[in-house]
């Protein structure tokens, strides 16, 4: 039976050209975690593996940084970055866990606005 | 020594499926992603995508999607691409190749190949 | 997709010759690109990595240069087993492309 719950950011926004950490953790189980994909949509971002280590897809490696741990820093964002991206968990022996994050990309002006005009 | 033995040639009717092996023997078969290729006459190489023994992760090159599936054993080291709905388009040279986990994009030991014809 | 073009698809050359292959990308690829031969009979190896760095085992008379969009091999002086079709790919980004192969033949 899968126990474990995972925990993610949530919903984040990010200034277009900066850096964002993308976050996930894994709780309430036991269970080993073997692997860590990182996707948006269904392409590969990067894979942590406990045994082999980290793997950058060839679209991300320039601007992709493994960690804080089992987390991901995307660099250099653009507009096109903004959307869904998902932490799948593979562990032993519960099976697979997936989180999502969603990720908006916006123009730098936009988010110091956003930043300057918050709801109290 | 490294070595990605696949199967022998294959004829198939239009809209069948035929699936197709690569055995790995002279390496740590989780060290590696497995790639596969396609090759017809006039159309050069086509990388249809790439498989992680390891975990299962497998991640395709959109023109293939839905009509290549790969599976790996990890116990007879052998990796596996089954084609679906066949029709004369998929007639051609199949090739598995190997490419080291982490940082690495090139594929360093290949196949002999495998011919598929797609005649009714 | 990134585009890889080989503009030439046949060449000829004699033994001992200098033969330079050329591949050029669709867009900048930042020196991210491979060189494989494919020998008569199918099988194919991996002669050059990262547009220069010589794969192990490969004879040193053939080396690798480039940037940007245009990038070439180069094979010092011709063997009669480099009678192969030549292929660039690069891995700038998903998917992986090819260009259309070089086929060297002897004068």
């Known amino acids: 039976m899968m126990t474990g719950t995972i925990e993610t950011t949530g919903n984040i926004s990010a200034e277009k050209g900066g850096s964002i950490i993308l976050q996930c953790h894994l709780s309430s189980t036991t269970a080993q975690v073997t692997q860590v994909n990182w996707e948006q949509q269904d392409q590969l971002l990067a894979i942590c593996n406990a045994d082999l280590g980290w793997h950058i897809s060839p679209s991300f490696k320039d601007r992709v940084a493994p960690g804080p741990g089992l987390g991901l820093t995307l660099q250099s964002l653009t507009v096109n970055d903004t959307g869904e991206y998902f932490c799948i968990y593979h562990t032993y022996p519960d099976g697979t866990y997936t989180g999502r994050i969603f990720l908006e990309v916006l123009e730098s002006s936009v988010a110091e606005h956003g930043a300057r005009f918050q709801i109290p | 020594q490294v070595q990605l033995q696949q199967s022998g040639g294959e004829v198939m009717k239009p809209g069948a499926s035929v699936k197709i092996s690569c055995k790995a023997t002279g390496y740590t078969f989780s060290n590696y992603w497995i790639e596969w290729v396609k090759q017809r006459p006039g159309h050069g190489l086509e990388w249809i995508g790439e498989?992680?023994?390891?975990?299962?992760?497998?991640y395709y090159n959109e023109k293939f999607r839905g009509k290549a599936t790969f599976t790996a054993d990890k116990s007879s080291n052998t990796a596996y691409m089954q084609l679906s709905s066949l029709t004369s388009e998929d007639s051609a040279v199949y090739y598995c190749a190997r490419q080291k986990y982490g940082n690495y994009y090139y594929f360093d030991y290949w196949g002999q190949g495998t011919t598929l014809t797609v005649s009714s | 997709d990134i585009q890889m073009t080989q503009t030439t698809s046949s060449l000829s050359a004699s033994l001992g010759d200098r033969v330079t292959i050329s591949c050029s990308a669709s867009?900048?690829?930042?020196?991210?690109l491979n060189w494989y031969q494919q020998k008569p009979d199918g099988t194919v190896t991996l002669l050059i990595y990262y547009t220069s760095s010589l794969h192990s085992g490969v004879p040193s008379r053939f080396s690798g240069s480039g940037s940007g969009t245009d990038y070439s091999l180069t094979i010092s002086n011709l063997e009669p087993e480099d009678i192969a079709t030549y292929y660039c790919?690069?891995?700038?980004?998903?998917?992986?492309?090819f260009g259309g192969g070089t086929k060297l033949e002897i004068k």
């Open positions: 790919q690069h891995y700038s980004k998903l998917p992986y492309t």
């Open positions: 498989i992680l023994p390891v975990s299962g992760s497998a």
């Open positions: 867009q900048g690829i930042s020196n991210y």
